[in-house]
């Protein structure tokens, strides 16, 4: 009778996470008697996966019917595979012994690799908004994938970006991996409607990449432009001055009118007009009773946008019974001291 051989026909098996893995093993003889055991890994630290003789192994089923009397097939199936199950599995024949069974012969081993899908990419932008012409960073993260090979691309409005850096961790062997990428994006005034996309391709995705998105509207702040003008009025003792606040984003805006440096009225922008590029416009007006003023008046439109330092523009309103000409406007940062009439 030829000596028993342990045959593991497959050097490697690849299984998708969540599926069952079948590990094949056959004996060439029924003799010598003794249990078949399956281990993950070799040496002293090996992990028992299945023992034919005894024990409870809820995830393991035998491929061949256990009650076959001449069974030489000791293949097993492991259910609900996770990346943690990856490793080399050995089918080991033990010879009956006293008091303990003795390892007799081992199969060559079957390497189980687990294909695990990456998690949905999560894209996050900068913590604070930036203005056009500045560069902001977006990060993309995905976890839990295996094998390690993965491709990540960045797009802005469908155009591929090149300024990014990507790391896959850990660098060595692991049951699963994570990817982290940072892209640098230069903001433009038209980016309120723009979107950045992080696209991940992996063998488990079968050509259908995962995408994570972020809107640049969360990252951009477009400061407003101000224009103060006087509108014609029928009544000679009244002047109508308007402040046109244009092309700002986001919405949050507070406007204060000052007459010769003194606060006349404060209002919060409510009914805004949205432009095609996603920015907003707003207009505020101020009625000035010219009779109440002997001298010329400097009217200042002061705007605080998105919690930033206020910007303002002033308009010199000439008080003259016969003259209705408009004064020049002046732009200032922050609060303005009263402006002398032009």
């Amino acid at each position: 009778e030829d000596e028993l051989q342990v045959i593991q026909p497959e050097k490697s098996v690849s299984v998708a996470a969540g599926e069952s893995a079948t590990l094949r093993c056959a004996m060439t003889s029924l003799i010598p008697v003794g249990p078949i055991m399956w281990f993950r890994g070799a040496g002293a630290g090996r992990e028992l996966i299945y023992n034919q003789k005894e024990g409870h192994f809820p995830r393991v089923t035998t491929v061949s019917e256990l009650t076959k009397r001449n069974n030489l097939d000791f293949s097993i199936s492991i259910s609900n595979i996770t990346p943690a199950d990856a490793g080399t599995y050995y089918c080991v024949k033990f010879r009956k012994g006293s008091p303990d069974d003795v390892e007799f012969k081992s199969g060559a081993g079957t390497e189980l690799s687990v294909r695990a899908k990456p998690s949905a990419p999560v894209v996050s932008g900068p913590a604070v908004r930036a203005t056009p012409e500045h560069t902001v960073s977006f990060t993309c993260e995905s976890h839990g994938f295996s094998p390690r090979d993965i491709t990540l691309k960045w797009f802005k409005n469908g155009n591929e970006l090149s300024d990014f850096q990507t790391n896959v961790d850990p660098a060595g062997d692991s049951v699963s991996y994570s990817i982290h990428s940072t892209a640098r994006v230069v903001l433009t005034r038209g980016d309120v409607h723009s979107q950045v996309i992080c696209e991940i391709a992996h063998i488990t995705l079968q050509g259908d990449p995962l995408r994570g998105t972020a809107n640049l509207s969360e990252a951009i702040r477009v400061p407003p432009t101000l224009e103060v003008t006087q509108q014609p009025m029928r009544a000679e003792n009244q002047a109508n001055v308007t402040c046109q606040v244009s092309n700002f984003y986001p919405r949050g805006l507070q406007l204060t009118w000052l007459e010769n440096g003194n606060v006349s009225r404060t209002e919060t922008a409510s009914t805004l007009i949205e432009n095609k590029d996603g920015t907003y416009n707003w207009m505020s007006w101020l009625l000035v009773n010219t009779c109440a003023h002997r001298d010329d008046v400097v009217l200042t439109c002061q705007v605080e946008h998105d919690g930033q330092q206020a910007v303002s523009k002033s308009y010199a309103l000439e008080i003259s019974a016969h003259q209705k000409e408009h004064g020049s406007d002046i732009t200032h940062e922050a609060a303005l001291a009263p402006t002398a009439p032009l």
Epitope: I31, V33, E65, T67, R69, R95, K96
Partner: antibody, heavy 120, light 106 residues
Amino acid sequence: EVQLLESGGGLVQPGGSLRLSCAASGFTFSSYAMSWVRQAPGKGLEWVSAISGSGGDTYYADSVKGRFTISRDNSKSTLYLQMNSLRAEDTAVYYCAKDGGSYYPPFDYWGQGTLVTVSS
Amino acid sequence: SYELTQPPSVSVSPGQTASITCSGDKLGDRYACWYQQKPGQSPVLVIYQDTKRPSGIPERFSGSNSGNTATLTISGTQAMDEADYYCQACDSSTAVFGGGTKLTVL
């Protein structure tokens, strides 16, 4: 309590047929292989045939191969042995025996036996 | 085909130790089982996997198996142990029995 109860034995002429039954109770019948073992008068035990728990695998001693057929009905927890072309040397008490499990099982339970006599 | 050989008979005095042997080629590489059969009764399993006793079998029954020989040992033999004993190789598709040994308690 495990119980195995054979029936169907009797006197039959050479060349005739008999069907033995073994009604099982007290265990999950489909989880165990079952066997027929016979014992001729004044002689030792002779294994005849075995069947796996599902019924998918059957085994026979050379002395009965081609003449006997083992089968089981797991829904009825019953084991059968169809014996055709009976010969005088098939005369014996036929025991139904349960395998003890999946790891080198002995016969851990036996029925009381049913006598088959083949004689003209 | 595989064959197992047993002595036809063994005699022992009450209280003494009885040993029944079972020989087969490299039997030590296989598992041996032993059955006890009293007259007019069905066989009863007394030893399996060489040395193990099923529940209900007295401790005086023990087994060993190495080389070409398996041995059933009954220590402190009692009159009720008088019976036929059969060895079996519990490892293959065909269950091979020995010819049986009649144990007489004198």
